[in-house]
């Protein structure tokens, strides 16, 4: 039982347990497709343990393989809403540094009002993740409908 | 190699590796939108290691941040089925204790027959998670189509 | 701090951190519904740490409970494409050894162009996972649209 106690006494960050779950703060100005996120216990059930927010975008603090997940629901949406305004697409990618820019995850809404997915991907300290919502539809800000998170899985 | 051996000898529960994957048992009576779950090796590939079932609802036994995931498929469903019977919505939330009641995850079927999503959320010992399916459509009981699970991620 | 250093010095495999993320290589010949996967740093952001590929199918090397996740997007697809050619269904299952053959995860596209889901499931060393796409539509090979992965979670 001594090991388990020792494990508890270590700072969790030294074990590499970086994790974050964010809620939508706002969308960008017209020509900026990025979603802007916020997190912290004062806001509800969102949090950042390791990663940080940089102007509403998530910045990674520890190298490793991460599970990235996202759900985005369109505001006041029915199946006809989505089909009237297609294409509405959500892409999650590394947007900085520019040398590492890449799309990690992409989904279109088609006749649905919600997209949700997840994937494993290597991320490096300093990588900033951006979530781009292309199209003219507003996402819901309800915290149970739209959220974005990462979880460090292994070095 | 001694550390890895020591780690194996410790009870897994002391490492906080609580995890559960459940299959649908049945729906509730007419005015009860909750889905009732079951789990255990005798039932197939479902299991509970740490969390428990309380009258078909999942009760958490260890504080921490959890990855909650769910997939629900509607029974004998085609894309037109879902549109015939609006609105069908699935919500996962803490339903007890009442003081911590909150919706964690919400999805509508619109013209689809399956919803699937996942999120990170803090849960506390004693929290009971309920999955509410509003609308009048029966969910599939096939174990590869409808399932619900949690995985402890970090303290 | 000594424990964290010791942890880093151990081979990660001894901690059971098996993980893989694969990208689509190709579909099978006409009567073979299986998707064939590939992975490795030379291919982009896909990787195998522990599991292996056997003729494009993922073989597990360590017993345990795994998080299995998948996203498949149909090529050059609109909501009408999917509805014209239904049923298009994606199933993830253990395909060998034959004695353990079982469907783990099943989703239909209906009027959508992407399916994405995840689940926890026990897997054993030697289990081979197959992903069967039934129907006549080609999946996208874009690495941000179609991917498949597993993550070891606990013994």
């Amino acid at each position: 039982q001594r090991f388990a106690q020792a494990q508890q006494q270590l700072p969790l960050e030294s074990l590499g347990w970086d994790v974050a779950e964010l809620q939508l703060n706002h969308t960008g100005p017209q020509q900026d497709p990025r979603l802007y996120w916020q997190g912290g216990p004062a806001l509800g059930r969102s949090f950042l343990h390791g990663p940080e927010l940089d102007k509403g975008q998530l910045r990674i603090h520890r190298d490793g393989i991460y599970m990235v997940h996202i759900q985005v629901t369109l505001a006041i949406c029915s199946s006809t809403t989505a089909s009237r305004h297609h294409p509405t697409t959500l892409a999650v990618g590394i947007c900085s540094p520019a040398s590492r820019s890449i799309s990690l995850l992409r989904l279109s809404f088609h006749q649905g009002c919600t997209i949700a997915s997840q994937r494993l991907t290597p991320l490096a300290r300093g990588d900033t993740l951006c979530t781009n919502l292309t199209g003219t539809l507003l996402p819901s800000r309800n915290t149970d409908e739209t959220f974005f998170g990462v979880q460090w899985v292994r070095p | 190699q001694r550390f890895a051996q020591a780690q194996q000898q410790l009870p897994l529960e002391s490492l906080g590796w609580d995890v559960a994957e459940l299959q649908l048992n049945h729906t509730g009576p007419q005015q009860d939108p909750r889905l009732y779950w079951q789990g255990g090796p005798a039932l197939g590939r479902s299991f509970l290691h740490g969390p428990e079932l309380d009258k078909g609802q999942l009760r958490i036994h260890r504080d921490g941040i959890y990855m909650v995931h769910i997939q629900v498929t509607l029974a004998i469903c085609s894309s037109t089925t879902a549109s015939r019977h609006h609105p069908t919505t699935l919500a996962v939330g803490i339903c007890s204790p009442a003081s911590r009641s909150i919706s964690l995850l919400r999805l509508s079927f619109h013209q689809g027959c399956t919803i699937a999503s996942q999120r990170l959320t803090p849960l506390a010992r004693g929290d009971t998670l309920c999955t509410n399916l509003t609308g009048t459509l029966l969910p599939s009981r096939n174990t590869d189509e409808t399932f619900f699970g949690v995985q402890w991620v970090r303290p | 701090q000594r424990f964290a250093q010791a942890q880093q010095q151990l081979p990660l495999e001894s901690l059971g951190w098996d993980v893989a993320e694969l990208q689509l290589n190709h579909t099978g010949p006409q009567q073979d519904p299986r998707l064939y996967w590939q992975g490795g740093p030379a291919l982009g952001r896909s990787f195998l740490h522990g599991p292996e590929l056997d003729k494009g199918q993922l073989r597990i090397h360590r017993d345990g409970i795994y998080m299995v996740h998948i996203q498949v997007t149909l090529a050059i697809c609109s909501s009408t494409t999917a509805s014209r050619h239904h049923p298009t269904t994606l199933a993830v299952g253990i395909c060998s050894p034959a004695s353990r053959s079982i469907s783990l995860l099943r989703l239909s596209f209906h009027q959508g162009c992407t399916i994405a889901s995840q689940r926890l499931t026990p897997l054993a060393r030697g289990d081979t996972l197959c992903t069967n796409l039934t129907g006549t539509l080609l999946p996208s090979r874009n690495t941000d649209e179609t991917f498949f992965g597993v993550q070891w979670v606990r013994p």
Epitope: - | L24, L74, I76, R84, H85, T136, L137, L138, N142 | -
Partner: antibody
Framework: QVQLKQSGPGLVQPSQKLSITCTVS????????VHWIRQSPVKGLEWLGV???????DYNAAFISRLNITKDNSKSQIFFKMNSLQTNDTAMYYC??????????????WGQGTSVTVSS | DIVLTQSPASLPIFLGQRATISCRAS??????????MHWYQQKPGQPPKLLIY???NLESGVPARFSGSGSGTDFTLNIHPVEEEDAATYYC?????????FGAGTKLELK
Amino acid sequence: QVQLKQSGPGLVQPSQKLSITCTVSGFSLTTYGVHWIRQSPVKGLEWLGVIWTTGVVDYNAAFISRLNITKDNSKSQIFFKMNSLQTNDTAMYYCARNSYYGNLYVMDYWGQGTSVTVSS
Amino acid sequence: DIVLTQSPASLPIFLGQRATISCRASRSVSASGYTFMHWYQQKPGQPPKLLIYLVSNLESGVPARFSGSGSGTDFTLNIHPVEEEDAATYYCQHSREFPLTFGAGTKLELK
């Protein structure tokens, strides 16, 4: 309590149109679908179609070309129209409520029936 | 279409005995973890009345002497002990897909 009351003519000329109204009480047409079934000594019970809460209708393919089912939620009424009746359409016509589960497709309450004879 | 074949067409039976009515489907009526077979009772001059849904679930208010069983394509309605008020025609119905179809009926007659 749940009731379905049917009204319509008993006698229809061959090639003419049949119209039946089903007025429901004790439940809302925005919550429950309503089926139409007919019964004859020769063919037994035949399912004709169903109108759902959204107004979407599913028809038996054998009758789709001459059947029209509509409703008025505010009046709690469902309207059944069948064209081009022949003598073999002589039957008892029923409306029946779909059970609570929309994809279970069972009828838990039935109207009293409308006896229809097709004859000149 | 799924064809439902009921047997026997007529079943004469004494009060207090067990009545067994069979229904065979031309193909499986199972899907999504359920079996979509149901039973109705019809008395002369009345509409059918739902007795049992999803093979074995008793509709509210139906006496416990009625029971249903079966799987795949073969199903059975049992009544035990048969009472006088059970004299009626019994129909099976599937709801696996459209069109919904019914069996031709089994007439339960008291001897």
